[in-house]
Amino acid sequence: GPASVPTTCCFNLANRKIPLQRLESYRRITSGKCPQKAVIFKTKLAKDICADPKKKWVQDSMKYLDQKSPTPKP
C-alpha cells in the first residue's frame, strides 16, 4: 500500500503570541497518536509553530487565516 505519512505531534506549545503578519497557514493536530490537541501554524520562513487551540490568540489567528484564504483547512 501507500507509504504512511508520519504524524507530527506537539509535546510543547508556544508561549509567545505570533504576530498575524508572520503566519501563512495552519493545520489542526487531532491524531489519537499525539498526547494533546494542537494547531500548527506555518510561518513565512516556512517553519512550524505548535500552539494551544484553547488560547484566544490562536483562535483569532485561525479565523484571520480562514478569512485570508478561502480554501478549507483540514
Epitope: P6, L45, K47
Partner: antibody, heavy 119, light 107 residues
Framework: QVQLQESGPGLVKPSQTLSLTCTVS??????????WNWIRQHPGKGLEWIGY???????YYNPSLKSRITISIDTSKNQFSLTLSSVTAADTAVYYC???????????WGQGTMVTVSS | DIQMTQSPSSLSASVGDRVTITCQAS??????LNWYQQKPGKAPKLLIY???NLETGVPSRFSGSGSGTDFTFTINSLQPEDIATYYC?????????FGQGTKLEIK
C-alpha cells in the same frame, strides 16, 4: 524544562573535521515546532548563526558555511550534531546549541563548548 | 544577508541610570527583532522578542521599541546585575543575523 548540553573535542587540528553533539533533556527532540540550532561566537566577538535542523531532518544552513557543514539528528538518542570540515584557526570559537520554537527566538541555550583549532 | 549595526559598541553607566542601545538593520525588517543579554562566560538569554515584547520572567525595567530599520533597547534603571553584552537579532530572512553587541559596564 528542556535543557541542552554540548559535547565534543576542545582541540581540533587544522584541515580536520570538527564534530559536536547537543543532547536534549527534559523534552523530546521529536516535538513538532522545535528547531534545533547551532550558533558560534569567536573569542571576544559577536554571535554567528550556523544553521538549524527540524525533527523531520529538514535543515537550513548559513550560506557562508554551507559548503563545510552538516547538521544531523538522532531522535532515538535525543541528540543533534554539527560537523564542520576543513577547519582553520578562524573556526576557533565557543559553539552553542539552541532551541527555537518555530518563532525564530532562541529561548533555550546550551552552556557552550570552546573549540580551538590549532596544530 | 541583512546587516545589523549596533551602537554604541560599549558604554559605561551608573546604577539607576537609563541606558539606551540602538540597532539598525540594512533593510526593512518590520518588527522581526529580538534582544539578548549575555553575561561573561554564559550563554545569551532572550529578553525581548518581536521588537517590544518582554520574554516571560524578564524584569520590566527592560524594554524595546522600533520598527522597519531602527530599533531601541532600554534599561530604565540600571542594576548591578545588568552588566553584560547585549545583542540584537533579526529574523526577517534566513540566515539570521546578529548585531555585533554592546558591552555595558558600570561606572
Amino acid at each position: 524544562q528542556v535543557q541542552l548540553q554540548e559535547s565534543g573535542p576542545g582541540l581540533v587540528k587544522p584541515s580536520q573535521t570538527l564534530s559536536l553533539t547537543c543532547t536534549v533533556s527534559g523534552g523530546s527532540i521529536s516535538s513538532g515546532g522545535n528547531y534545533w540550532n547551532w550558533i558560534r561566537q569567536h573569542p571576544g566577538k559577536g554571535l554567528e548563526w550556523i544553521g538549524y535542523i527540524y525533527y523531520s531532518g529538514n535543515t537550513y544552513y548559513n550560506p557562508s558555511l554551507k559548503s563545510r557543514i552538516t547538521i544531523s539528528i538522532d531522535t532515538s538518542k535525543n541528540q543533534f550534531s554539527l560537523t564542520l570540515s576543513s577547519v582553520t584557526a578562524a573556526d576557533t570559537a565557543v559553539y552553542y546549541c539552541a532551541r527555537d520554537g518555530g518563532d525564530d527566538a532562541f529561548d533555550i541555550w546550551g552552556q557552550g563548548t570552546m573549540v580551538t583549532v590549532s596544530s | 544577508d541583512i546587516q545589523m549595526t549596533q551602537s554604541p559598541s560599549s558604554l559605561s553607566a551608573s546604577v539607576g541610570d537609563r541606558v539606551t542601545i540602538t540597532c539598525q538593520a540594512s533593510q526593512d525588517i518590520s518588527n522581526y527583532l529580538n534582544w539578548y543579554q549575555q553575561k561573561p562566560g554564559k550563554a545569551p538569554k532572550l529578553l525581548i522578542y518581536d521588537a517590544s515584547n518582554l520574554e516571560t520572567g524578564v524584569p520590566s525595567r527592560f524594554s524595546g521599541s522600533g520598527s522597519g530599520t531602527d530599533f531601541t533597547f532600554t534599561i530604565n534603571s540600571l542594576q548591578p546585575e545588568d552588566i553584560a553584552t547585549y545583542y540584537c537579532q533579526e529574523y526577517n530572512n534566513l540566515p539570521y543575523s546578529f548585531g555585533q553587541g554592546t558591552k555595558l559596564e558600570i561606572k
